[in-house]
């Protein structure tokens, strides 16, 4: 009679997360009697996956009915794969001892490697606002893939993006891995509506990658431009002041009309229009009564846009031109929540 | 390690029935097939009937195929074997036996449990 | 059914020298290369214990002064040299079809 030997087939079984591991292994011999057991790597720290003899290995199901006569099959399956359970497993097949069975013979041992899919990838982006013409970091991070290989691209609306940094982690073995990219991108003034995607593709996945997305309204600061304008004269003694504010984003804007330096008004940016690249425009008025005026008044328009240092915009108003109206120092009524009078 | 334990003795009246236990330890009780033996006093041994834990599947030998049932409880990890319509041929010990190898032998033996059918 | 055949009934053996039982079945109880006969010592108030498995492998734990052989339909259990310890009766059992006991052969020392 030869000498039982156990053969373990597959070399290497590959499968899917989630789903059933089979590995396979075979006795040449009934001799000696004996239990199979199953470990996970070899040597004094080798994890029991199965053991015929005695235990509870709920995940764990025989191929072959082991009770049927002169069964030398003793293949099993593993269910509910994680990439946890990566490793190579031993078939080993023991002598019945007293008291206890004595190792006999290791099967050569049968690699499972774990195909796990990538998680979702997740871009994220500066924690405060930028402006045009300075660069921002975008990062995008995917988890729990196996094997290792894997491709990340960065775009900017449908353009691929060339500046970015990518660490694949661990670097050496592991059960599963983690991608990690960091993309710097130029802002524009018409990047409201741009997106930034991360797109990772992975052996799992089939050829149908996975994206993740940014959406540049979240980074940039669009500055408003201020232009400051004397309208026609409404009446004899009164001005219409305008100040427009344009290309501004986002739409958070507070506006304070100064009169010679003093506060005369302050107003939120309320009925805005947007333009088709996204950033709003938004005007304000002031009428000011010229004949309360003995000198020239100097109009300002300030703008707090986004949290940001005020800027403004300053417009002479000359009144030697008009006819003064003399004891008129009372106050003329607001016509309008964007209208003031001045004494 | 494998233990097989069966009471010591069952005294019985004739035609009355009697149900042996054996309760398995040490081992997967479902993993291997339970063999019954009986053993007449100063007599040789009786191959009875086998069962497989698993799914209760049996095979019996016919001559104690109307006299002897067999089952088990995975729950507790017992098999029984229950004896019928007694007489004083039933008089015995009645072994069971593990077969470790899945080679219709009997590797490990309970001590054995001598009925004794008696009015 | 396969019936088994042992001789003789008893023996007495010297203490040292070679006690050999026979056992014959009715067919062979060979197959696919194995020989499906097992041999069982039974000392007095004790359940049997397996000696010997598939005609020649001797049990955990069994003394190398017993050996199987064999093959078809006649099988050989030999104890040499034979202990004290060795008084018993000695059974084969095929397990080829459903099991069967051999009659039994009684080994006495002297």
């Known amino acids: 009679e030869e000498e039982l030997q156990v053969i373990q087939p597959d070399k290497s079984v590959l499968v899917a997360a989630g789903e059933t591991a089979t590995l396979r292994c075979t006795a040449t011999s009934l001799i000696p009697v004996g239990p199979i057991q199953w470990f996970r790597g070899a040597g004094p720290g080798r994890e029991l996956i199965y053991n015929q003899k005695e235990g509870h290995f709920p995940r764990v199901t025989t191929v072959s009915d082991l009770t049927k006569r002169n069964n030398m099959d003793f293949s099993i399956r593993i269910g509910n794969i994680t990439p946890a359970d990566a490793g190579t497993y031993y078939c080993v097949k023991f002598r019945k001892g007293s008291p206890d069975d004595v190792e006999f013979k290791s099967g050569a041992g049968t690699e499972l490697s774990v195909r796990a899919k990538p998680s979702a990838p997740v871009v994220s982006g500066p924690a405060a606002r930028a402006t045009p013409q300075h660069t921002v970091s975008f990062t995008c991070e995917s988890h729990g893939f196996s094997p290792r290989d894997i491709t990340l691209k960065w775009f900017k609306n449908g353009n691929e993006l060339s500046d970015f940094q990518t660490n694949v982690d661990p670097v050496g073995e592991s059960v599963s891995y983690s991608i990690h990219s960091t993309a710097k991108v130029v802002l524009t003034r018409e990047d409201v509506h741009s997106q930034v995607i991360c797109e990772v593709a992975h052996v799992t996945l089939q050829g149908d990658p996975l994206r993740g997305t940014a959406n540049l309204s979240e980074t940039i600061r669009v500055p408003p431009t201020l232009e400051v304008t004397q309208q026609p004269v409404r009446a004899e003694n009164q001005v219409n002041v305008t100040c427009q504010v344009r290309k501004f984003y986002p739409q958070r804007l507070q506006l304070t009309w100064l009169e010679n330096g003093n506060v005369s008004r302050t107003e939120t940016a309320s009925t805005v229009t947007e333009n088709k690249d996204g950033t709003y425009n938004w005007m304000s008025w002031l009428l000011v009564n010229v004949s309360a005026h003995r000198d020239d008044v100097k109009l300002t328009c300030q703008v707090e846009h986004d949290g940001q240092p005020a800027v403004s915009k300053s417009h002479d108003l000359k009144v030697s031109a008009h006819p003064k109206e003399q004891g008129s120092n009372t106050a003329a009524e607001n016509t309008g929540s964007n209208e003031r009078n001045i004494y | 390690q494998v233990q097989l334990q069966q009471p010591g003795t069952e005294l019985v009246r004739p035609g009355a029935s009697v149900k042996l236990s054996c309760k398995a330890s040490g081992y997967t009780f479902t993993n291997y097939w339970i063999n019954w033996v009986k053993q007449r006093p100063g007599q040789g041994l009786e191959w009875i009937a086998m069962?497989?834990?698993?799914?209760?599947?049996?095979h019996y030998n016919q001559i104690f195929k109307d006299k002897a049932t067999l089952t088990v409880d995975k729950s507790s990890n017992t098999a029984y074997m229950q004896l019928s319509s007694l007489t004083s041929g039933d008089s015995a010990v009645y072994y069971c036996?593990?077969?470790?190898?899945?080679?219709?032998?009997?590797?490990?033996w309970g001590r054995g449990t001598s009925v004794t059918v008696s009015s | 059914d396969i019936v088994l055949t042992q001789s003789p009934a008893s023996l007495a053996v010297s203490l040292g020298q070679r006690a050999t039982i026979s056992c014959r079945a009715s067919k062979s109880v060979s197959s696919s290369g194995y020989n499906y006969i097992f041999w069982y010592q039974q000392k007095p108030g004790q359940p049997p214990k397996l000696l010997i498995y598939l005609a020649s492998n001797l049990d955990s734990g069994v003394p190398a002064r017993f050996s199987g052989s064999g093959s078809g339909t006649d099988f050989t259990l030999n104890i040499h040299p034979v202990e004290e310890e060795d008084a018993a009766t000695y059974y084969c059992?095929?397990?080829?079809?459903?099991?069967?006991f051999g009659g039994g052969t009684k080994l006495e020392i002297k």
């Open positions: 059992q095929h397990s080829r079809e459903l099991p069967t």
């Open positions: 069962i497989d834990p698993s799914d209760s599947e049996t």
């Open positions: 036996a593990m077969d470790y190898g899945s080679l219709y032998a009997m590797d490990y």
